[in-house]
Amino acid sequence: SAPFSFLSNVKYNFMRIIKYEFILNDALNQSIIRANDQYLTAAALHNLDEAVKFDMGAYKSSKDDAKITVILRISKTQLYVTAQDEDQPVLLKEMPEIPKTITGSETNLLFFWETHGTKNYFTSVAHPNLFIATKQDYWVCLAGGPPSITDFQILENQA
């Protein structure tokens, strides 16, 4: 798409991990769980131990973008959340280490993190009009908005 090719020459350099072991809950208070190995989905949990714990790494853009650009990794793994296309599930991509530099087609690993009060939004850098979203009876995917849920609460320090 046009936005993707426009951004593809921007280089993103890894800075540091800024959050460890947090849980993402959607607006229906469903937690993200790992389903069937490479997929994520949302479910109302009795036991929060079933919720995925994420780490968040920050990247700095060569374009000096004001937006906070992040990568999402499942804690204690080498699995990174990877965007596909609109309404397609996000996938878990295994990489030996966190990428030091990301550019071009690899920007599907990156998200712009925006906060509005307690609401958190993750926009795909590769598809800037699409958000990480939950959808009833479906996987965590990329979506532009309703009926998918695009706002998340970050739960930290869950024992």
Epitope: A35, N36, L40, E50, V52, F54, K76
Partner: antibody
Framework: EIQLVQSGAEVKKPGASVKVSCKAS????????MNWVRQAPGQDLERMAW????????TYADDFKGRFTFTLDTSTSTAYMELSSLRSEDTAVYFC???????????????WGQGTTVTVSS | DIQMTQSPSSLSASVGDRVTITCRAS??????LNWYQQKPGKTPKLLIY???RLHSGVPSRFSGSGSGTDYTFTISSLQPEDIATYFC?????????FGQGTKLEIK
């Protein structure tokens, strides 16, 4: 209540085939992978294969490639294991077990079927 | 593949005893260690996941600990109904191997 209910015991002759079913209830079938585990008489647990219940893709442990086939019927939340060209050494209890990731990083098998005994004898 | 070595292979203890079983992984498994109980002629049951978390409905006399490559399963006060074989299993990387099992008997 989460339950995995397997089909009943089977007695087969060498060279025959057997198909074991595992019907799941009490949870969203496609959200959790399914495992098949073998326990031969007096032996330890061996994880034979695991199935992505969304895509139907099976991943086999090295010792179980060839004569084993694992299938799904998502409309009835049922997993199947088929074993062809049966041999006496296939005599064992076969379990299905739901796979779950704790924290997204640690895999366990939290609910198990009651087991299906397959006896191969001439 | 990660290998799991469980010890002892069998043990005999009296009712009320504290019982300990160990499991060693061939490499660091980051606390991704589960324990299962299998009573004679029955299906395995998940007792403990992620080193120390009790699965729902499991009595508190069962516990787990450890880190890195070395893990321990403990029954604080052995009960007659605890007669079973206990298996560890690593949940870090495929193929998520089981240990060889420890058969627990009452003296």
């Amino acid at each position: 209540e989460i339950q995995l209910v397997q089909s009943g015991a089977e007695v087969k002759k060498p060279g025959a085939s057997v198909k074991v079913s595992c019907k799941a209830s009490g949870y969203t079938f496609t959200n959790y992978g399914m495992n098949w585990v073998r326990q031969a008489p007096g032996q330890d647990l061996e994880r034979m294969a695991w199935i992505n219940t969304y895509t139907g893709e099976s991943t086999y442990a090295d010792d179980f490639k060839g004569r084993f086939t694992f299938t799904l019927d998502t409309s009835t939340s049922t997993a199947y294991m088929e074993l062809s060209s049966l041999r006496s050494e296939d005599t064992a209890v076969y379990f299905c077990a739901r796979g779950i990731y704790y924290y997204g990083s640690s895999y366990a098998m939290d609910y198990w079927g009651q087991g299906t005994t397959v006896t191969v004898s001439s | 593949d990660i290998q799991m070595t469980q010890s002892p292979s069998s043990l005999s203890a009296s009712v009320g005893d504290r019982v300990t079983i160990t499991c060693r992984a061939s490499q660091d498994i980051s606390n991704c260690l589960n324990w299962y109980q299998q009573k004679p002629g029955k299906t395995p049951k998940l007792l403990i996941y992620y080193t120390s978390r009790l699965h729902s409905g499991v009595p508190s006399r069962f516990s787990g600990s450890g880190s890195g490559t070395d893990y321990t399963f403990t029954i604080s006060s052995l009960q007659p109904e605890d007669i079973a074989t206990y298996f560890c299993q690593q949940g870090k990387t495929l193929p998520y191997a089981f240990g060889q099992g420890t058969k627990l008997e009452i003296k």
